[in-house]
């Protein structure tokens, strides 16, 4: 806390000026009017104030706006934003995408801080849904943003926003998140032709059900092994050898290298060895010839 002292003669600030970097903390407190600071926040960013000096400037704004800063001030906070706590940010009402961009720019190149997470949360809740422009902005700054959301939060993403998603944005998504995103992507890209559709939908396929994989196998898509390995095990298991062969096309040879890893391992265990042999890859572990496969789940359903 900076104690209240009178401003020395000749040091009263009439605008935010670069001479202020020489002011000590108590002089900034005494000589810089909070209302002046609020109207000239953009100038603060042009001046290399120390963190201690920024503490004083923040304190002045806090006193002026105890209920939270207005957006006109927030938009020009610049690197003073780094001084804000999540508690401070929860008092804000940020509605402008430009304000969001300006503050994300300050934190650019760093991990998502609790301040940024709170800011984004406030912004998205204020908008009611994660629209395309917002998603575009957030994934541009934080490629992993989408995968940091819960399936419940992802459910508010409108299909139109899916167009903003890049493959790298989904790198850290788990199956539960892809389960939510895949139907939205399918809806978003439904009017595209076969090959273009596959390019767009590919990174979302970790949420695809069996019937969609079967449909894709009829379209000569040549899915790469990396994509195949991210598919849901329960969606892959019912696929026949012929369907997997069609789905992977020339990439089918890669199954050998992955035969000990899920979902390939589990899929092999469900296939007849005869059928696996037709691939000519030396895949082992299939159901031996002459064995009868009982689908117990089907039996239970019938009873």
């Amino acid at each position: 806390e900076v104690e209240k002292t009178a401003c020395p003669s000749g040091k009263k600030a009439r605008e935010i000026d670069e001479s202020l970097i020489f002011y000590k903390k108590w002089e900034l407190e005494a000589c810089v009017d909070a209302a002046l600071l609020a109207t000239q926040m953009d100038r603060v960013n042009a001046i290399p104030f120390t963190y201690e000096q920024l503490d004083v400037l923040k304190h002045k704004l806090d006193e002026l706006y105890p209920q939270g800063y207005p957006e006109s001030v927030i938009q020009h906070l610049g690197y003073l934003f780094l001084k804000m706590s999540p508690e401070d940010i929860r008092k804000w009402n940020v509605t402008s995408l430009e304000t969001l961009k300006a503050l994300l720019e300050v934190n650019k190149g760093h991990e998502m801080s609790p301040q940024v997470a709170t800011l984004i949360d406030r912004f998205v809740k204020g908008r009611g849904q994660l629209d395309k422009d917002t998603l575009d902005t957030l994934t541009a700054f934080y490629p992993g943003y989408l995968c940091s959301l819960s399936p419940e939060e992802l459910s508010s993403v409108p299909p139109s926003s899916i167009w903003a998603v890049r493959p790298q944005d989904l790198d850290t998504c788990d199956p539960r998140q892809l389960d939510v995103l895949y139907p939205k992507a399918r809806l978003a890209f439904q009017n595209m032709n076969g090959s273009e559709y596959f390019v767009k939908i590919q990174s979302f396929l970790g949420g695809a059900p069996t019937e969609d994989l079967k449909a894709l196998s009829q379209q000569n898509v040549s899915m790469d092994l990396a994509t195949f390995m991210k598919l849901r095990t329960d969606a892959v298991l019912p696929l026949t050898v012929a369907e997997v062969q069609k789905l992977l096309g020339p990439h089918v040879e890669g199954l050998k290298a992955e035969e000990r890893h899920r979902p390939v391992r589990d899929w092999i265990l469900r296939q007849r060895q005869d059928d696996l042999d037709t691939l000519g890859l030396g895949l082992q572990g299939g159901i031996p010839n002459g064995y009868l496969v009982l689908d117990l789940s089907m039996q239970e359903a019938l009873s």
Epitope: G10, A13, E18, S19
Partner: antibody, heavy 121, light 107 residues
Framework: QVQLVESGGGLVQPGGSLRLSCAAS????????MSWVRQAPGKGLEWVSA????????FYADSVKGRFTISRDNSKNTLYLQMNSLRAEDTAVYYC??????????????WGQGTLVTVSS | DIVLTQSPATLSLSPGERATLSCRAS??????LAWYQQKPGQAPRLLIY???SRATGVPARFSGSGSGTDFTLTISSLEPEDFATYYC?????????FGQGTKVEIK
């Protein structure tokens, strides 16, 4: 009364290094930003570098950036200028000066007598 | 960078005369100017800061004025000890700039 006394000047070869010191007395050294200003023989004044009272920020003229380093030890009331990769054009009298300021006005209110640095082979 | 140009380079006057020294900035500067006096073999001495405030111990015959791009140092009546070189100085963009100096010599 305020006194600033520079030392450490001398003859040095191009590419060499030198460390200047400025001993301050007669005022609370830790309350003031400090600076180095130089003057080549028969020429005008040229600002070199400045440092905040608490060493939180430092500033340099483009002509010395990357070669000179300003520092201070408030416990010893001393200002320093480490000069590396010296060139012939760095030859000058180097003054230590105290920085004072008002709103929109930053100036040097007290100066030392200077120490001569000669860079020559 | 802002360049400060002082004129004239040399001013030849007699004791008792009025000296008017000019300092012009290459662009409008929001900050205030300072003026220094330097005698041969001596360190500079602060005369005027904030464009018009006299430093401690500076005689009243020295006065400063101006703003924007044009600043003036006036010595109302030259004393023998006033014959020296005078420099203007500006703080801008976190660096300090000096003018090239005006030498006031005895006519």
């Amino acid at each position: 009364q305020v006194q600033l006394v520079e030392s450490g000047g001398g003859l040095v070869q191009p590419g060499g290094s030198l460390r200047l010191s400025c001993a301050a007395s007669g005022f609370t050294f830790s309350d003031y930003a400090m600076s180095w200003v130089r003057q080549a023989p028969g020429k005008g004044l040229e600002w070199v570098s400045a440092i905040m009272y608490d060493s939180s920020s430092t500033f340099y003229a483009d002509s010395v950036k990357g070669r000179f380093t300003i520092s201070r030890d408030n416990s010893k009331n001393t200002l320093y200028l480490q000069m590396n990769s010296l060139r012939a054009e760095d030859t000058a009298v180097y003054y230590c000066a105290r920085i004072n300021y008002i709103y929109k006005g930053v100036h040097f209110d007290y100066w030392g007598q200077g120490t001569l640095v000669t860079v020559s082979s | 960078d802002i360049v400060l140009t002082q004129s004239p380079a040399t001013l030849s006057l007699s004791p008792g005369e009025r000296a008017t020294l000019s300092c012009r900035a290459s662009q409008i500067v929001s900050g205030y100017l300072a003026w220094y006096q330097q005698k041969p073999g001596q360190a500079p001495r602060l005369l005027i800061y904030g464009a018009s405030s006299r430093a401690t111990g500076v005689p009243a015959r020295f006065s400063g004025s101006g703003s924007g791009t044009d600043f003036t140092l006036t010595i109302s009546s030259l004393e023998p000890e006033d014959f020296a070189t005078y420099y203007c100085q500006q703080y801008y963009n976190f660096s300090f700039t000096f003018g090239q100096g005006t030498k006031v010599e005895i006519k």
